[in-house]
């Protein structure tokens, strides 16, 4: 099923000359699983463990993790083993670290807030800069001011309205009455002044099976940058797409199973069936990544009767670009992610 988390094995190769004799084995074969899968708390994913054996409740942010007890992929978590050198056996579930931003030649760290000038407050979140205005532009005065004009006032950052009366003497405007209109005006002005920004979606966090993709958007009531996420599945892990490449072809850019299917997520099933397309593979040193895609809303129904919906990447076409990097480096693609309009001869 297209969105089922792919069984993940974590193979951490220790650095040379390090003692790994004390590294415990968390996987046992043959598999020994309880007769029925566990019931996970609301919001915690039911996934296959890292041994590819049993269903387990995914480890959450701050929980310990091992090659068997894996972190929740739907929450963009990974197992950070850095605190367990040289064994690399028990880690802690951590959020995938976001990348920094560069604006006007200045580098900002992920999560850092800054003011590029006196008119805007900006935040760097995962490579995207979201800004909110510090100058609220109230409506220009009406009726009583025939020639309103915005002027810069020395010592003040934000421009202000002035009214040029018949004597051509500018005077600072003031509203004639203070009622509900002003509050509405403030809200509308806030929205008019909000520089709407939505970053591109990040590459999928996994090269096969279920992953997460994120973006930053300030298109909300507060005009504040928020992270949105969607589920993504670039290709199934259990299908060898190489065998499907036609004779004489170097790539199969898109793989589409013939049968439609229901998506499953954390034990819940999509309320309708889909026939998704996946990105394929190449015989040469090229990677196929989504080129034409959109985000769809998928509704899920759970065995306990509860339902929820998730945003999901829907692939229409894939672009096989010129080089493959480490498929586990989810940020590598950000450097040269193909823009729809830039792929040319």
């Amino acid at each position: 099923t297209a969105l089922s988390p792919a069984p993940t094995t974590m193979d951490f190769t220790p650095a040379p000359l390090e003692d790994t004799s004390s590294r415990p084995q968390f996987c046992k074969w043959p598999c020994e699983c309880p007769p029925s899968p566990p019931r996970c708390p609301l919001g915690v994913s039911l996934i296959t463990d890292g041994c590819e054996c049993c269903k387990m409740c995914a480890q959450q942010l701050g929980d310990n993790c091992t090659e068997a007890a894996i972190c929740d992929p739907h929450r963009g978590l990974y197992c950070d083993y850095s605190g367990d050198r040289p064994r690399y056996a028990i880690g802690v579930c951590a959020q995938v670290v976001g990348v920094g931003c560069v604006l006007d030649g200045v580098r900002y760290n992920n999560g850092q807030s800054f003011q590029p000038n006196c008119k805007y407050n900006c935040t760097c979140i995962d490579g995207a800069v979201g800004c909110t205005p510090l100058c609220l532009r109230v409506r220009p005065p009406r009726l009583w001011c025939p020639h309103p004009r915005r002027v810069s006032i020395p010592g003040h950052c934000c421009e202000q309205w002035v009214c040029e009366d018949d004597a051509k003497r500018p005077r600072k405007t003031a509203p004639r009455d203070t009622g509900a209109f002003d509050a509405v005006g403030e809200v509308e002005a806030w929205h008019r002044n909000c520089i709407a920004y939505t970053s591109p979606w990040s590459p999928c966090s996994t090269s096969c099976g279920l992953g997460v993709s994120t973006r930053i958007s300030n298109v909300n009531a507060q005009c504040w940058p928020e992270q949105e996420s969607r589920l993504c599945n670039l290709r199934p892990c259990d299908v060898d797409i190489h065998t499907l490449i036609k004779a004489g072809k170097k790539c199969l850019a898109v793989y589409q199973p013939e049968a439609s299917m229901n998506f499953t997520l954390a034990g819940c099933i999509s309320t309708r069936s889909y026939q998704p397309k996946y990105c394929g593979v190449c015989m040469d040193n090229r990677c196929c990544i989504p080129y034409k895609s959109k985000t769809i809303d998928v509704s899920f129904q759970c065995p306990d009767g509860l339902g929820f919906s998730r945003q999901v990447l829907w692939i229409n076409a894939c672009f096989c670009n010129l080089s493959c990097r480490n498929p586990n480096d989810i940020f590598a693609d950000l450097e040269s992610y193909p823009d729809f309009s830039e792929i040319a001869n």
């Epitope: 790539c251 898109v254 001869n345």
Partner: antibody, heavy 121, light 113 residues
Framework: EVQLVQSGAEVKRSGASVKVSCKLS????????IHWVRQAPGKGLEWMGG????????VYGDKFKGRVTVTEDPSTDTAYMDLKRLTFEDTAIYYC??????????????WGQGTLVTVSS | QSVVTQPPSVSGAPGQRVTISCTGS?????????VHWYQQLPGTAPKLLIY???NRPSGVPDRFSGSKSGTSASLAITGLQAEDEADYYC?????????????FGGGTKLTVL
């Protein structure tokens, strides 16, 4: 109903470049690709290039490789064809045409009205 | 010189049946790629007439039919009418070592006598 509206006729000097646009309505560039085909006066149809859904790349006819660039802008549902180093033989009507991004679907469903490009000395 | 060949012209009287052939090679039609047909009336853009060897888009009269066998295909028009006078092009997809190409036949001018 899908419609393709192309930019107006162009007269260009030999050696110059031309950029023809093709605006899509009734569908989006997320679901289909736009290819370019030209027709010299009194001659047949000649495919120039477009996105090959199964190869996962923009491909070009041998005759045009290195001289033509096809691009798509999904934000405006507009495609462009840029042809460089024009010669008199490039005088033709240039058509854009749609292909649905579906495996094995290699035909052109809808066509633009055509853009006449005349190359003069 | 087209990779796919068509006769330059065919003619027929109103009401008659005419066929237009389209011959390819092992890298296009013979490789299993479909053949499609387009009609181009004088002074207009081409229009899809037959797709996938024998399928008609909605609005195309059933007087037009297509077939494919081996490395060739043909378009048949029965009950010929004056408004059928146009250029007809076959088209396929060619996949060879040099790359992928959409290929057109050289076109056939149909004259209704």
């Amino acid at each position: 109903e899908v419609q393709l509206v192309q930019s107006g006729a162009e007269v260009k000097r030999s050696g110059a470049s031309v950029k023809v646009s093709c605006k899509l309505s009734g569908d989006t560039l997320t679901d289909l690709s736009i290819h370019w085909v030209r027709q010299a006066p009194g001659k047949g149809l000649e495919w120039m290039g477009g996105f090959d859904f199964e190869d996962g790349e923009i491909v070009y006819g041998d005759k045009f490789k290195g001289r033509v660039t096809v691009t798509e802008d999904p934000s405006t549902d507009t495609a462009y064809m840029d042809l460089k180093r024009l010669t008199f033989e490039d005088t033709a009507i240039y058509y854009c045409a749609t292909i649905k991004d579906i495996p094995g679907r290699y035909y052109f469903d809808f066509w633009g009205q055509g853009t006449l490009v005349t190359v003069s000395s | 010189q087209s990779v796919v060949t068509q006769p330059p012209s065919v003619s027929g009287a109103p009401g008659q049946r005419v066929t237009i052939s389209c011959t390819g090679s092992s890298s296009n039609i013979g490789a299993g790629y479909d053949v499609h047909w387009y009609q181009q009336l004088p002074g207009t853009a081409p229009k899809l007439l037959i797709y996938g060897n024998s399928n008609r888009p909605s609005g195309v009269p059933d007087r037009f039919s297509g077939s494919k066998s081996g490395t060739s295909a043909s378009l048949a028009i029965t009950g010929l009418q004056a408004e059928d006078e146009a250029d007809y092009y076959c088209q396929s997809y060619d996949s060879s070592l040099s790359g992928s190409n959409w290929v057109f036949g050289g076109g056939t001018k149909l004259t209704v006598l």
